[in-house]
């Protein structure tokens, strides 16, 4: 009486279940009279000896590939053995690797948490995920796990983290890189510095005074506002750095306190006030400006 091991499916994919059934085609006896045991490469599987002729392996992995058979034992202790069946577990290569960011869009505030999430649309088994910084990649981290996504965390984003990133996934069929993702670290403006430039040491009425306002830190573009005694004189945008300037043609009324404000949409900062005083001399002497 020959035992038959039925494997379903016969060519399983990693991560999927496999059903093993021990059949006795030449015996009509009730299965209840037998104890069954399933083996792989000389090792008993599952519960060992059992009255059930079926065994389900919930998740098959590449390393579960091997030679399987079953045995049946009668009440009289006679042991029947099936032929060996070779089960080869098929690994699905990784495909469609993508890199996403949290927060989405690759824009993060300085000091905030940035997560780079590497995903594969398909792929089974242990997948090795690698994260790289720069188009010529500096390897940041490597993780191996049995999942379709993995995360790399930058707990506190800094200006130096603004770069291109990509990830690579690999499960034995060669590395597969994601596309590039660009990270922008958004930096609130620092307190701007207001500088006053006059054409001469003692400026006179009619001279053009240059007010220059610059925030040394902050993501661009930065919009600068210029104030005289809290009244807006005008504004100027600096798309890429170097601050902004405002030209003022001097009149006697221009004495007083000047300030500027920098705003890049992430918060506004006001400069310290600069006091400009005119002394109005008598006679033919000109009005002079001192600060």
């Amino acid at each position: 009486a020959g035992l038959l091991l039925i494997v379903s499916p016969s060519h399983p994919t990693e991560g999927s279940p496999v059903n093993l059934t021990c059949k006795m085609p030449s015996l009509q006896s009730s299965d209840a009279q037998f104890q069954f045991c399933f083996f792989r490469d000389d090792q008993a599987l599952g519960p060992g000896w059992s009255s059930s002729p079926k065994l389900q392996i919930a998740n098959m992995w590449k390393e579960d590939s091997g030679s399987y058979w079953c045995e049946a034992q009668t009440m009289a202790s006679k042991v029947l053995r099936s032929w060996r069946s070779q089960i080869n577990v098929h690994r699905v290569p990784v495909a469609d690797v993508s890199l996403e960011t949290q927060p989405p869009g690759g824009q993060v505030m300085e000091g905030d948490r940035l997560v780079l999430i590497c995903s594969v649309a398909m792929g089974t088994g242990d997948i090795t995920f690698l994260w790289y910084k720069g188009a010529i990649g500096l390897n940041l981290q490597t993780k191996t796990q049995r999942s379709l996504t993995a995360e790399y965390e930058i707990p506190t984003a800094r200006e130096s983290d603004a770069e291109q990133y990509y990830c690579v996934a690999e499960n034995g069929y060669g590395p597969r890189p994601s596309g590039l993702v660009s990270i922008t670290v958004r930096i609130p403006v620092s307190r701007p510095i207001l500088m006053v430039r006059a054409p001469r040491a003692q400026a006179v009425v009619g001279d053009v005074l240059k007010l220059h306002c610059e925030a040394l830190r902050g993501s661009h573009p930065i919009l600068y506002w210029f104030y005289h005694e809290d009244v807006i004189l005008g504004s100027s945008s600096a798309p890429s750095g170097g601050g902004a300037s405002f030209n003022l043609s001097l009149t006697a009324e221009h004495s007083g306190n000047y300030s500027c404000e920098a705003n890049n949409g992430l918060g506004a900062q006001r400069s310290e006030e600069v006091t400009l005083n005119f002394t109005v001399p008598t006679g033919a002497r000109s009005n002079h400006l001192t600060s």
Partner: antibody
């Protein structure tokens, strides 16, 4: 299949500007950097710089700064290179090329755009 | 800039010959990440360059195994074991380790 289709030959006068285009197809345009390479008649190859179409970020060879401006339009999957204040030194064939990160090589090239200066 | 010097400038060959092209860099082209970004390209007349070898010795897919690359530090070599008619053209080495990236001056492979 991946293709980089460049604009046709240009005949321009010294001092003028010109814009060469490189239209990408067959892949996700924002996933790879586009590089530009110059080849003077009968001479070797010079790397000009690259642009990342995802955000317009650029990296230039210092030699070409001020001469060259690289831009990209995501909606049409097209990269552009503008050359300004043209002189006879700018007469060349210009190539765009896609560079694959991780493996690090230029795997696809445009067919080249010939720029000729004529007074 | 890293100067890439190719020798010889011209290489007259007979079909079936084994040939070597040398490329020397003015400084080491090992990147700070440990990789050496040295590539070889072949350009035929009127065409754009085509990749042969990347990272010193890796053959690009579809490139015949008669092409091989070797070297380290500053000295690199491209070998063709048996030259075929389709191999004729100008060969360029390229370094992508240090900005600005630079090409060698080229080696013209031609029939004797």
């Amino acid at each position: 299949q991946v293709q980089l289709q460049q604009s046709g030959p240009e005949l321009v006068k010294p001092g003028a500007s010109v814009r060469i285009s490189c239209k990408a197809s067959g892949y996700t345009f924002t996933s790879y950097n586009i590089h530009w390479v110059k080849q003077r008649p009968g001479q070797g190859l010079e790397w000009i710089g690259w642009i990342y179409p995802g955000d317009g970020n650029t990296k230039y060879n210092e030699k070409f700064k001020g001469k060259t401006t690289l831009t990209a339009d995501k909606s049409s999957s097209t990269a552009y290179m503008q050359l300004s204040s043209l002189t006879s030194e700018d007469s060349a064939v210009y190539f765009c090329a896609r560079r694959i990160h991780y493996f690090d090589y230029f795997d696809y090239w445009g067919q080249g755009t010939t720029l000729t200066l004529s007074s | 800039d890293v100067l890439m010097t190719q020798t010889p400038l011209s290489l007259p060959v007979s079909l079936g010959d084994q040939v070597s092209i040398s490329c020397r860099s003015g400084q080491t082209i090992v990147h700070s990440n440990g990789n050496t970004y040295l590539e070889w390209y072949l350009q035929k007349p009127g065409q754009s360059p085509k990749l042969l070898i990347y990272k010193v010795s890796n053959r690009f897919s579809g490139v015949p195994d008669r092409f091989s690359g070797s070297g380290s530090g500053t000295d690199f070599t491209l070998r063709i074991s048996r030259v075929e008619a389709e191999d004729l053209g100008v060969y360029y080495c390229f370094q992508g380790s240090h900005v600005p990236w630079t090409f060698g001056g080229g080696t013209k492979l031609e029939i004797k």
